[in-house]
Amino acid sequence: SIPWNLERIIPAWQQTEEDSSPDGSSQVEVYLLDTSIQSGHREIEGRVTITDFNSVPEEDGTRFHRQASKCDSHGTHLAGVVSGRDAGVAKGTSLHSLRVLNCQGKGTVSGTLIGLEFIRKSQLIQPSGPLVVLLPLAGGYSRILNTACQRLARTGVVLVAAAGNFRDDACLYSPASAPEVITVGATNAQDQPVTLGTLGTNFGRCVDLFAPGKDIIGASSDCSTCYMSQSGTSQAAAHVAGIVAMMLNRDPALTLAELRQRLILFSTKDVINMAWFPEDQRVLTPNRVATLPPSTQETGGQLLCRTVWSAHSGPTRTATATARCAPEEELLSCSSFSRSGRRRGDRIEAIGGQQVCKALNAFGGEGVYAVARCCLLPRVNCSIHNTPAARAGPQTPVHCHQKDHVLTGCSFHWEVENLRAQQQPLLRSRHQPGQCVGHQEASVHASCCHAPGLECKIKEHGIAGPAEQVTVACEAGWTLTGCNVLPGASLPLGAYSVDNVCVARIRDAGRADRTSEEATVAAAICCRSRPSAKASWVHQ
Amino acid sequence: QDEDGDYEELMLALPSQEDSLVDEASHVATATFRRCSKEAWRLPGTYVVVLMEETQRLQVEQTAHRLQTWAARRGYVIKVLHVFYDLFPGFLVKMSSDLLGLALKLPHVEYIEEDSLVFAQ
C-alpha cells in the first residue's frame, strides 16, 4: 500500500516506515521556493519553518478571492512529497519555505532572484549542513536566473528544478535550462512521460532525469489530515530533492557533480517509451527514471561518467557547437553528431581555462551537436595529443606517449569538407591498440589521462549488413569514456554515448554485400578505476 | 545554457539628440537588453540591471544612484526596488522603458533583463 511513486524511487530494501534517521532528524535542509504552505498539516508539522520571505506579484483580476487552502495548495503538496511523514521521500528532513508564487501560482523572475539571494544570505549568516533548493517553477529562458542558480550552486548548494509542463524543450525555460541545476522531467506509474491536458512534461538535453510526477498523493491544504493527488514536473522535482536530501544525509560530503553522476548511474534505464517525444528530441532526452542510490560506502571509487550534449549549432557553414562539463568533471572524450551527416568532426579545445568539446558543421549541413563525455575520477590529469592533418602519406596513429597515461577518447576533424574522407576507417584496436588512427586528411586528437589505477581498453562491434546504427556496450565494472564510429561504405552521422552504450549512427548506403573491412563499427573506449593498480592499457 | 536563449537580445541605441544630455554616459552602450521570448509572460516596466561580475558593492549602489539622477534630469521618476550583491552585482528597478537606452550606457552594466513571470509547475 506504499504509494506507487515511493515504491518506484526507493528500492524495497531501503524502505522504512519510519523517519530516515532513527530520531527523525536530518542535518540536510531543503529550501522550497513556492506558494505559501500549511505548516500545521500532520504530514509536515514540526518539519517546516516558514521563513518571513515573501516576494510575489499581485493576483490577476479584481474579483480574485484569496482562499487560504487554495493559496497553500501547491507548496503544501510539495513539502509533503519532499519530507512528509507518510507520503514523503526524505521523511526526516527539515524544510524552509519561501513564498515566491502567489495564490494563482504565479511569480516573477525578480522575486525568485531575491529568494535565491535570501538563501545565500541565510547561508552566510548561519552556516549549517548541506542545503538543497527546490525550484518547482518555470518561466521563459532567463540569463540572470540561470546565472543566479550557477552562483548559488558554486557555494555548494544543490538546486533541483522542475523541467516544466509545456511539452517542449526544457532548454527554453528557466531555471530548467541552467546547467548547474538538476532538472527533472515527469513520468507516470507506467514509467511513461506525463501528459497534462494538451501539454505534458518537458524534455530534451537540459533534462537530467525523470521522476514520478503523475497522480502523486501528498498533503492537501484542505485540512490538516487531507491528502490529494497532484501531477506535474514540480512533483517530479520534489522526489529528486527528497532523494538528494537522503543522499546528503548519509554522505554529507557529496558534491553537486557526484550527486548528479550518482543519480544518473543508479537511475532505472530504458523504461520510457521515447516515441512520446518529438523525433529530433529523442536522442537528446535521457531515458532514465530516478531511484535512490546506495550509499557511497557500498559503491565508492568507481569511475562515473555522463554524456553532455551541446545546443544545436545551427546550419551556417562555419557553425560550431560546444559542450561543457561541470567544473569538477574531466572531459574524457568528445564526439559529434549531425542528422545530415555533413560535419567536419570534433575536437577538444581550451576556452577560458576549461577544456570543451567542439563540433564543426560542414557546408550544406543542417547543423551539428557536440557530445562530451564528462567524468569524475579522483586525481585525474588529462592532456590532448594532436596530430595535424597530413598533406599526404599514410594514416598517422596518435597514441599516449606520456608514462602511465591511457587513451580515453579520440576526436577527428577535417579543415575542409570531404565527406569521402570521413568514410575511411579511423580507429582499429586490433591493429593498433591504444591509438587513434585518422585518415590522412583529418586532424587527430587523442585524449590521454593519468589517474591512479585507471585502465582502459577498446571494445568494437561491427555490422556488415545494412544498418542505421551500431552499438557496443562496456561490460559491468567498466565505464564508457569514448565513443567513435568507424564507417564502412556508409556516411557516418556521428557517434554518442547513451549511459554505458556507444552508439554509432550512419546513413546506410543500402549495400548488403559488404566485407568485414567495409563494416560499420562502433568503437567504445571502456575504462575502470582500480585505485590499487597502475594506469594501464588493456590489450584485448 | 546561455547559447540557448530563445530569447530576445536587443542592442538599444540612444537617440542622437539625447547624447548631448548624457554627460558621463556618453560612451556607446556595449550592454545588451534581454527579454522573455513569450510576450504574454513579459513584465515591462521592471528590469534587472546586471553589472559586471567584479563590480564592488559600493559601485552597485553608485550605479543605481547615477541612473536615478540621470532619469530625474529628464523628468523621469525611477524606483530602485532591490539591490543585489550576494549572488551577482545588480539592482532591480521600476522605470519607463524610455530609459533603457540610458541605462545600457551606464558604466559596469553587462546587460539588462526585463522582468517576467514564472509559474508553478
Epitope: E18, P22, D23, E43, G46, D222, C223, T225, C226, Y227 | -
Partner: antibody, heavy 118, light 107 residues
C-alpha cells in the same frame, strides 16, 4: 512490528477515576499522534481525543473535555487516558489507536473494557 | 461537528455478491475519509484511507470511492469472512467522527 498493548479490563466504582494505559512498541512513539476511541456494548465508535507524543499537544471531542485527560510518558513510550467522575454511562471498551497522517488509524490496541459498578 | 451518516444499519448479502455501503458527510470533507472493519470481539481494522486507497494487505475486493460529501465502500465479491460491521470516519476536522456503522450479514 507495531504493537499497542492495553490491559484487558478495569472494574471501578461510580464517582472514581481510572487511568488507562497504552504501551507502544515497534515504531518511534513520538512520530505519530495517538487517539482514544470509546465503544459502548453493541454501539458504534466514538472519538474521544488525540495527543501528539512529541510535544503533548491535545485535541478533544467537546463531549469528553471534562471527562478525559490525555497524557504521555515518552521514556516508556506509553500513552494514558484518565477518566474521572465515572458513571455507568462510561462503561465501555476504550481503544487507543495510532494515527499515521496518510493512513489514518492504522494500528489499534485490543481495547480495555471499563466496567463502572458499585 | 461533521455528522457522518451510514443510511443502512444492516445489509444482507450472499457469498459472491457485490455489495456497496454508502456514507454521507454533513459538509465537504474533501477525500479525508477512512473505512474500518470490525469483526465480533475484535478491534477495528483499517481498510481504506483517503477515500479510495487500499491499506497494506487489504484484499483488492475492497474498494472505496467518493469525495466531498458522498462516499461509497464496495466489496466486489463477498466472502464468508467479511461478516463484520463497517464504519466510515471523517478526518477532515476535529472532532473526528464515525458513521453509525453498517453490519454486513451473510445469508
Amino acid at each position: 512490528q507495531v504493537q499497542l498493548q492495553q490491559p484487558g479490563a478495569e472494574l471501578v466504582k461510580p464517582g472514581a477515576s481510572v487511568k488507562l494505559s497504552c504501551k507502544a512498541s515497534g515504531y518511534t512513539f513520538t512520530s505519530y499522534w495517538m487517539h482514544w476511541v470509546k465503544q459502548r456494548p453493541g454501539q458504534g465508535l466514538e472519538w474521544i481525543g488525540e495527543i501528539n507524543p512529541s510535544n503533548g499537544r491535545t485535541n478533544y471531542n467537546e463531549k469528553f473535555k471534562s471527562k478525559a485527560t490525555l497524557t504521555v510518558d515518552k521514556s516508556s513510550s506509553t500513552a494514558y487516558m484518565q477518566l474521572s467522575s465515572l458513571t455507568s454511562e462510561d462503561s465501555a471498551v476504550y481503544y487507543c489507536a495510532r494515527e499515521r497522517p496518510l493512513y489514518a488509524m492504522d494500528y489499534w490496541g485490543q481495547g480495555t473494557s471499563v466496567t463502572v459498578s458499585s | 461537528d461533521i455528522v457522518m451518516t451510514q443510511s443502512h444499519k444492516f445489509m444482507s448479502t450472499s457469498v459472491g455478491d457485490r455489495v456497496s455501503i454508502t456514507c454521507k458527510a454533513s459538509q465537504d470533507v474533501s477525500t479525508a475519509v477512512a473505512w474500518y472493519q470490525q469483526k465480533p470481539g475484535q478491534s477495528p481494522k483499517l481498510l481504506i484511507y483517503s477515500a479510495s486507497y487500499r491499506y497494506t494487505g487489504v484484499p483488492d475486493r475492497f474498494t472505496g470511492s467518493g469525495s466531498g460529501t458522498d462516499f461509497t465502500f464496495t466489496i466486489s465479491s463477498v466472502q464468508a469472512e467479511d461478516l463484520a460491521v463497517y464504519y466510515c470516519q471523517q478526518r477532515y476536522s476535529t472532532p473526528r467522527t464515525f458513521g453509525g456503522g453498517t453490519k454486513l450479514e451473510i445469508k
